[in-house]
Interface confidence: low
């Protein structure tokens, strides 16, 4: 009679993560008597997957009833497959021996490849806010996918970005892979409502990419513009001066009025109006009693926005002239070193 052969008909098997893998194995003879064992890998470091004779293998079931005397089908099913299960599986026939069974013949092996979906991309932006015209970096990460071939794209408000670099790790063979991409985005004044999207396409997603998003509202800081104007007289000796704080984001803003360098009033922006582009406007006013001043008054509106150095704008109030004759003098000036912070 011809010597027993162990046949593994499938050179390779491809299974999606979470599914069940069927590894087929048949013997060509009932002789010699002895059990079958399944191993992952070959050589001394091989891992026992199933032993017909003894042991507890909760994820493994046999395809046929191995207790039947004439059974020659030793195929197994492995449930709930993960990328860590990838490898080459060998069906090995043992010959009954004393005290131990002796390995008799091995199948050629079946390579189990696992298709695993990438995790949802996580997009993260810079730790600190940045102002328009600055370039900021966003990173996108997705993990746990297999096979290695993957496509990643970046979009800003639906427009594809080109300034990015992507790495897939590890470079060599692995049970699963990770992708890491860094994109550079130039901020504009209109970006409060903008979104950056990282899109990952993989064979396991069947053409429906995964997306991760970041809102630029968490990244951008739009500094305010200031305008100080003198309003028409409210009373004989009173002048109303307003400070218009325009186009700022985020809302966190504190305003201080100074009269000739002395603090007159400090307030925090509360009732703001929102512009279409997501930025805010706010107005503060100061009522100045002209009769209390002998000389000209320098009124300064000083704004501290989102913890940044204060910016200010001043207005000279001439007290020599009668208030009614001043009209709407708007000869305002930027204060020295803060000029660069004014947009």
């Amino acid at each position: 009679e011809e010597e027993l052969q162990v046949i593994q008909p499938d050179k390779s098997v491809l299974v999606a993560a979470g599914e069940t893998a069927t590894l087929r194995c048949t013997a060509t003879s009932l002789i010699p008597v002895g059990p079958i064992q399944w191993f992952r890998g070959a050589g001394p470091g091989r891992e026992l997957i199933y032993n017909q004779k003894e042991g507890h293998f909760p994820r493994v079931t046999t395809v046929s009833d191995l207790t039947k005397r004439n059974n020659m089908d030793f195929s197994i099913r492995i449930g709930n497959i993960t990328p860590a299960d990838a490898g080459t599986y060998y069906c090995v026939k043992f010959r009954k021996g004393s005290p131990d069974d002796v390995e008799f013949k091995s199948g050629a092996g079946t390579e189990l490849s696992v298709r695993a979906k990438p995790s949802a991309p996580v997009v993260s932006g810079p730790a600190a806010r940045a102002t328009p015209q600055h370039t900021v970096s966003f990173t996108c990460e997705s993990h746990g996918f297999s096979p290695r071939d993957i496509t990643l794209k970046w979009f800003k408000n639906g427009n594809e970005l080109s300034d990015f670099q992507t790495n897939v790790d590890p470079v060599g063979e692995s049970v699963s892979y990770s992708i890491h991409s860094t994109a550079k985005v130039v901020l504009t004044r209109e970006d409060v409502h903008s979104q950056v999207i990282c899109e990952v396409a993989h064979v396991t997603l069947q053409g429906d990419p995964l997306r991760g998003t970041a809102n630029l509202s968490e990244t951008i800081r739009v500094p305010p513009t200031l305008e100080v104007t003198q309003q028409p007289v409210r009373a004989e000796n009173q002048v109303n001066v307003t400070c218009q704080v325009r186009k700022f984001y985020p809302q966190r803003l504190q305003l201080t009025w100074l009269e000739n360098g002395n603090v007159s009033r400090t307030e925090t922006a509360s009732t703001v109006t929102e512009n279409k582009d997501g930025t805010y406007n706010w107005m503060s006013w100061l009522l100045v009693n002209v009769s209390a001043h002998r000389d000209d008054v320098k009124l300064t509106c000083q704004v501290e926005h989102d913890g940044q150095p204060a910016v200010s704008k001043s207005h000279d109030l001439k007290v020599s002239a009668h208030p009614k004759e001043q009209g709407s003098n708007t000869a305002a000036e930027n204060t020295g070193s803060n000029e660069r912070n004014i947009y």
Epitope: I150, Q165, T166, I179, S181
Partner: antibody, heavy 121, light 107 residues
């Protein structure tokens, strides 16, 4: 259009140093890795390593560790290969090549014209 | 390292003929194979990547096929300008390795 223009041929003595440049144009330089490939006379192509043009991180193949250095001048969109302590077996044409832009998958869509380095006493 | 073997150093063909250049990897490279054409005194030009994807501008007479360890570059109707060296390269894992090349000669 996309171009990689390499510096001219070099004749060096054993023990000397050579630095080859590769200037890129027609694309965003920091989006694509720059690879270096050696072709000795009558021999096949051998990948030497690459440099990440965004982070500046070089990766040398095992056979090209020690005497071989990859560097960048990003503002000038130029990559460099420097070979120290030249040996006769370094005689070859050296190519820079732009890697495919999805991560580390490395096939090479665009190549420089090659720089012939001859090492002879 | 993955070894890429091009068993034919030379192949002779005639204009209009169909020719197949083969490449064998020392292990499964999961379709991560590129093919290059190098003409005398020139740098290599990529023809195919991911085993069968033609690079932009490559004539459709060039086709790549294969899986596992065995890959083929086929020129369906050889033209005189196809006289060149052809290299395969695996882009599966570093170090990226090339085959020894196959020189296509026109009768």
């Amino acid at each position: 259009q996309i171009q990689l223009v390499q510096s001219g041929p070099e004749l060096k003595k054993p023990g000397e140093t050579v630095k080859i440049s590769c200037k890129a144009s027609g694309y965003t330089f920091t989006n694509y890795g720059m690879h270096w490939v050696k072709q000795a006379p009558g021999k096949d192509l051998k990948w030497m390593g690459w440099i990440n043009t965004y982070t500046g991180e070089p990766t040398n193949a095992d056979d090209f560790k020690g005497r071989f250095a990859f560097s960048l001048e990003t503002s000038d969109r130029t990559a460099f290969l420097q070979i120290n302590n030249l040996k006769n077996e370094d005689t070859a044409t050296y190519f820079c090549a732009r890697g495919h832009h999805y991560g580390n998958y490395a096939w090479f869509a665009y190549w420089g014209q090659g720089t012939l380095v001859t090492v002879s006493a | 390292d993955i070894v890429m073997t091009q068993s034919h150093k030379f192949m002779s063909t005639s204009v209009g003929d169909r020719v197949s250049i083969t490449c064998k990897a020392s292990q499964d490279v999961s379709l991560a194979v590129a093919w290059y054409q190098q003409k005398p005194g020139q740098s290599p030009k990529v023809l195919i990547y991911w085993a069968s994807t033609r690079h932009t501008g490559v004539p459709d007479r060039f086709a790549g096929s294969g899986s596992g360890t065995d890959y083929t570059l086929t020129i369906s109707s050889v033209q005189a300008e196809d006289l060149a060296l052809y290299y395969c390269q695996q882009h599966y894992s570093t170090p990226w390795t090339f085959g020894g090349g196959t020189k296509l000669e026109i009768n």
